[in-house]
């Protein structure tokens, strides 16, 4: 026999859910134990079945989830999943805030990503901080050269998608470049989008050869410049 435990605690790290009105919210508390535990939900400490909620709720016990569609300000509160079996119980609190302000294009923090200089063989991190009412999606792009040209006939740059991610609002998104070589030098773009539109900012990575005399032994592996 075993008391309940969280099977995917990394999926529960986002405690505060700040969601625009009209959106769908999903809380999950994936758990296991022996015997198989049951899950129930509380709102602000009271048993929550959604009977007073317009549109009700969806409880998917096999997914350990609570789903509320078209959230409104009255849905704000603390939602607790209570998982229990004969051996013991565990609980986790989610905080829901329903936002009513005007959703806007993603806003990228000025100066990020930052122009960076690194030595061949070192590791580089490019940062992008996004502020968005709606959940943003991010792409990291590298500007590339095709047939000796950086731009197509339409005047737009050639880009290669390096990474795509859906992130939580106000998270820092990082592009890791390991063991950089001269070929990694160039322009990198952080592109953030939501249902309203896209925003993007770029930075240049300069890669210096290992034996470059201007690079002192005491210098850090990667240097960030504006």
């Amino acid at each position: 026999q075993q008391a309940p435990y969280w099977t995917h605690p990394q999926r529960m790290e986002k405690k505060l859910h700040a969601v625009p009105a009209g959106n769908t919210v999903k809380f999950r508390c994936p758990a296991a134990g022996n015997p198989t535990p049951t899950i129930r939900w509380l709102k602000d400490g009271q048993a929550f079945h959604g009977e007073n909620r317009i549109g009700g709720i969806r409880l998917r016990h096999q997914h350990w989830s609570l789903v509320m569609e078209s959230v409104v300000p009255s849905d704000r509160g603390t939602y607790t999943c209570l998982v229990e079996n004969a051996v013991g119980s565990i609980r986790y609190n989610y905080l829901l805030d329903v936002l009513e302000r005007s959703p806007h294009r993603p806003i990228l923090q000025a100066g990020l990503p930052a122009n960076t200089t690194a030595v061949v063989g070192s590791d580089v991190e490019l940062l992008c901080k996004v502020y968005s009412d709606a959940q943003p999606h991010i792409q990291w792009l590298k500007h590339i050269v095709i047939n000796g040209s950086s731009f197509g006939a339409d005047g737009f740059p050639y880009v290669q998608v390096l990474k795509t991610a859906d992130i939580n609002s106000s998270e820092v998104e990082v592009l890791y470049l390991r063991n950089v070589s001269a070929e990694d030098a160039g322009e990198y773009t952080c592109l953030a989008g939501n249902s309203i539109g896209l925003s993007y900012q770029s930075a240049w990575l300069t890669v210096l050869p290992e034996e470059d005399p201007t690079w002192t032994a005491a210098a850090p592996e990667a240097r960030y410049t504006d």
């Epitope: 769908t24 806007h104 959940q135 939501n194 309203i196 539109g197 925003s199 993007y200």
Partner: antibody, heavy 124, light 112 residues
Framework: EVQLLESGGGVVQPGRSLRLSCAAS????????MHWVRQAPGKGLEWVAV????????YYADSVKGRFTISRDNSKNTLSLQMNSLRVEDTAIYYC?????????????????WGQGTMVTVSS | DIVMTQTPLSLSVTPGQPASISCRSS???????????VYWYVQKSGQPPQLLIY???NRFSGVPDRFSGSGSRTDFTLKISRVEAEDVGVYYC?????????FGGGTKVEIK
């Protein structure tokens, strides 16, 4: 060819419901946010609602909030607008409009492709 | 909500002559990424709006170079350098920076 084709318009009495559809073709529908915009007879343009590429985010104009629901079926390349509790002032041509995509914007990031529109008349 | 105010209401232009339409927003449309999110459309009789200019001054593909957009922050202008008969229609500006997206009231362009 990139195309949006609206359907479902018609004449309906105040208080009743109507469901509009928009069939998309010629582009990867599931990668784009989608909007509805309407235009009352002889009047200007009014934005109605938007839905994100995956349906997880929806926003509405105050004038339709609580009455209209925007939804999408990416497996069928279809955008919908469920209109309940219709009012006389909802009478308009309803346009389906492509919004922002998920990738690098080779041109405008949305509001470039409009459907031909479908007419909704709310009258007793 | 951002209010978009367009002037004039209507414009009667001789073919070959220039035309200018103004649009003012109640808040700045200059975004943190350095772009100004004002769009211009023309709507011809019985048709949906057609995009002319995006992000203040970029001509959409297929739009003749006699159309140009300019301005900054809250004041925007659409210019037609030499009006042609096919330019007849109602012109709208739109802000595309936040929801609700809002349009100007329209400017009707006719040929003298």
């Amino acid at each position: 060819e990139v195309q949006l084709l609206e359907s479902g318009g018609g004449v309906v009495q105040p208080g009743r419901s109507l469901r509009l559809s928009c069939a998309a073709s010629g582009f990867t529908f599931s990668s784009y946010a989608m909007h509805w915009v309407r235009q009352a007879p002889g009047k200007g343009l009014e934005w109605v609602a938007v839905i994100s590429y995956d349906g997880s985010n929806k926003y509405y104009a105050d004038s339709v909030k609580g009455r209209f629901t925007i939804s999408r079926d990416n497996s069928k390349n279809t955008l919908s607008l469920q209109m309940n509790s219709l009012r006389v002032e909802d009478t308009a041509i309803y346009y389906c409009v492509r919004g922002a995509g998920r990738g690098y914007p080779y041109g405008p990031d949305g509001f470039d492709i409009w459907g031909q529109g479908t007419m909704v008349t709310v009258s007793s | 909500d951002i209010v978009m105010t367009q002037t004039p209401l209507s414009l009667s232009v001789t073919p070959g002559q220039p035309a200018s339409i103004s649009c003012r927003s109640s808040r700045s449309l200059l975004h943190s990424d350095g772009k100004t999110y004002v769009y211009w459309y023309v709507q011809k009789s019985g048709q949906p709006p057609q995009l002319l200019i995006y992000e203040l001054s970029n001509r959409f593909s297929g739009v003749p170079d006699r159309f140009s957009g300019s301005g900054s922050r809250t004041d925007f202008t659409l210019k037609i350098s030499r009006v042609e008969a096919e330019d007849v229609g109602v012109y709208y500006c739109m802000q595309y920076i936040e929801a609700p997206l809002t349009f100007g009231g329209g400017t009707k362009v006719e040929i003298k």
